[in-house]
């Protein structure tokens, strides 16, 4: 019995659902009562899901798997794995037994995009040409391990004096910290690029240093110029720092975080004490770092509704403030493609191709093109609907008249993450049914 699975690994984003495709060719008169189907982990032989004696025997894998019962009789033995985790990565074997027996293994490659890097400088004040500074580039919650590249403001690679460390959290996601030590020139731009090698996703940030003395007087409060980009459900750090003078003590510090527009209190530190979160108990300071001038705020389990500007007010003797923007994002799922009509298609027929991608934020950009890369812009209707969490489901509909044959591809881009998800469908000229019957 020939069992077919994709040659290439199935790439799935952490937290999304993945389909491990597996198919066989049922003979005429085949009934599900004859079918024994087992999915198991290739290496450990752990049972994942099974179908036997005409019945779905259910998930043996954390209740996160499902078959496609309506499609089994057509030879579709694919497995749906929900809420993918890093620990799911590996090989899954699909065993099919009717009269004969066959099996094949499909690889699941798990991935998670890295956040836009944050850049910090040490020391961060009174910088002069000739000073040695340490620039730290930090990017969070990605998988698998990142590749990190540094360059100057004219594209020259900086490879000396770079130390990169990557630490996995409980979920197996990596936080990357890359440190560059440089001797300052008159001025300079230093940029750090963090690449996810599986998603081929680049996240980059840069810092321009103009050595000069800081002005005296008001407290200089420093925040990142660029918005902080955070994935829905992850934690975000809104960076804010000030330069404590010698002899500074926390008893002198008044620190207030509030929403810039509404002035709603988010978190505060006064009278030498952390006054706690006034924002759904999802915020925290870094108490051990406050005395060093680190007034950053940790926002947990980020939601779409958190997007916006947060102001960091610091008062010691003098007073200073700065606002940092939080940009929330969520990657779009790999688009699913449907055709209407989907059978007995002939050249000259008008078909409606629907491309659907789910649970992304912010709104997507959708591009259609044919098999030669020619953009298809006529007869396209795209709708985007937000769910209760504010995440968008995208449905883009293309109406085309079939030629002799043709490939139609749909690219769904998350403009913040610069994450592209695409699907395509190839329609051949002879009468056909979609999806092709096994």
């Amino acid at each position: 019995l020939e069992v077919q699975v994709p040659e290439d690994p199935v790439v799935a984003l952490v937290g999304t659902d993945a389909t491990l495709c597996c198919s066989f060719s049922p003979e005429p008169g085949f009934s599900l009562a004859q079918l024994n189907l087992i999915w198991q982990l290739t290496d450990t032989k752990q049972l994942v899901h099974s179908f036997a004696e005409g019945q779905d025997q259910g998930s043996a894998y954390a209740n996160r798997t499902a078959l496609f019962p309506d499609l089994l009789a057509q030879g579709n033995a694919s497995l749906r794995l929900q809420r993918v985790r890093v620990a799911d990565e590996g090989s899954f074997t699909c065993f099919v037994s009717i009269r004969d027996f066959g099996s094949a293994a499909v690889s699941l490659q798990v991935a998670a995009p890295y956040s836009k890097p944050s850049m910090t400088l040490e020391p961060n004040k009174d910088l002069r040409p000739g000073d040695t500074v340490t620039i730290t580039c930090s990017s969070y919650q990605g998988y698998p391990e990142a590749e990190v590249f540094w360059q100057d403001g004219q594209g020259v690679p900086l490879t000396g004096n770079v130390t990169t460390s990557q630490m996995a959290n409980e979920q197996g996601l990596f936080d990357v910290h890359s440190i560059l030590r440089v001797v300052l020139g008159a001025n300079g731009t230093y940029s750090c690029l963090v690449r996810n090698p599986v998603l081929q996703q680049d996240a980059h940030s840069s810092v321009t240093i103009t050595p000069q003395r800081s002005p005296t007087g008001a407290v200089e409060v420093q925040v990142p110029e660029d918005p902080v980009v955070a994935l829905v459900g992850t934690d975000a750090t809104l960076r804010c720092s000030f330069s404590p003078e010698p002899g500074f003590s926390l008893a002198q510090l008044n620190l207030i975080w509030q929403l810039t527009d509404t002035k709603q209190l988010v978190h505060s530190f006064t009278e030498g004490r952390d006054q706690g979160s006034a924002y759904a108990n999802r915020t925290a300071l870094f108490p051990d770092l406050l005395a060093q001038g680190n007034a950053s705020l940790r926002l947990q389990r980020v939601r779409v509704a958190d997007e916006g500007s947060f102001t960091c007010f610091v008062s010691i003797r003098d007073f200073g403030s700065a606002a940092v923007s939080l940009q929330v994002a969520a990657p779009y799922s790999k688009p699913s493609m449907t055709l209407e009509p989907n059978k007995d298609l002939r050249p000259g027929d008008t078909v409606t191709i629907t491309c659907s991608s789910y649970r992304g934020y912010p709104e997507a950009e959708v591009f259609w093109q044919d098999g030669q890369g020619v953009p298809l812009t006529g007869n396209v209707t795209t709708s985007q609907m937000a769910n209760e969490q504010g995440l968008f489901d995208v449905h883009s509909v293309l109406r085309v008249v079939l030629g002799a044959n043709g490939t139609y591809s749909c690219l769904v881009r998350n403009p913040v993450l610069q994450q592209d998800a695409h699907g395509s469908v190839t329609i051949t000229g002879q009468p056909m049914t979609f999806p092709p019957e096994a």
Partner: antibody
């Protein structure tokens, strides 16, 4: 129009030196690095090194480090490549090119027309 | 040094063919650029930052990446596409080019 115009062809004796010029126009000369690349007859492209006209920082391919000097004259927006102790295998077309783009992606967007250097006794 | 190995070195094809040229890096690169060169002419920028087409480059050109392997695809060869193509990286010194792939008319 952004242009890099190189000096004319040179015929040199083994052991001598050659100095090739590359005059930039149509953009701020100090904003981009200028690189030198050579191509021997029927062969591929080989990087020699670059100069930052603003800081005058240079870096060289180790292969050429001992024999090559890159300089830049900001007053005339001209970059120079001098190659000494010439040998027959230095016979090649020498190109200057501007490394352009924006962080973090850069590429050679403008090339000179090339200068043919022939080393022959 | 990061070596870039292009394959094939020579490729004969006909107008209308779909062709692929591969550039394999000996280690990870921050991005890859591609240049087109015709006999007696200077190289021209063709693809930059791994997959972006330079100005005036037709959309039949595309690049895909798998690990350290970058593949340049021309979906339907046109007469003006016959030339030599070079890949280039500068993630670390020295800047390196692939040895080139010469695309000839069959």
């Amino acid at each position: 129009e952004v242009q890099l115009v190189q000096s004319g062809a040179e015929v040199k004796k083994p052991g001598s030196s050659v100095k090739v010029s590359c005059k930039a126009s149509g953009y701020s000369f100090t904003s981009y690095t200028i690189h030198w690349v050579r191509q021997a007859p029927g062969q591929g492209l080989e990087w020699i090194g670059y100069i930052n006209p603003n800081s005058r920082n240079t870096d060289y391919n180790q292969k050429f480090k001992d024999r090559t000097t890159l300089t830049a004259d900001r007053s005339t927006s001209t970059a120079y490549m001098e190659l000494s102790s010439l040998r027959s295998e230095d016979t090649a077309v020498y190109y200057c090119a501007r490394y352009s783009g924006s962080t973090p992606y850069w590429y050679f967007d403008v090339w000179g027309q090339g200068t043919t250097v022939t080393v022959s006794s | 040094d990061i070596q870039l190995t292009q394959s094939p070195s020579f490729l004969s094809a006909s107008v209308g063919d779909r062709v692929t040229i591969t550039c394999r890096a000996s280690s990870s690169v921050s991005y890859m650029n591609w240049y087109q060169q015709k006999p007696g002419k200077s190289p021209k920028p063709w693809i930059y930052a791994t997959s972006n087409l330079a100005s005036g480059v037709p959309s039949r050109f595309s690049v895909s990446v798998s690990g350290t392997e970058h593949t340049l695809t021309i979906s339907s060869l046109q007469p003006e596409d016959f030339a030599t193509y070079y890949c280039q990286q500068w993630s670390s010194n020295p800047l390196t080019f692939g040895q080139g792939t010469k695309l000839e008319i069959k």
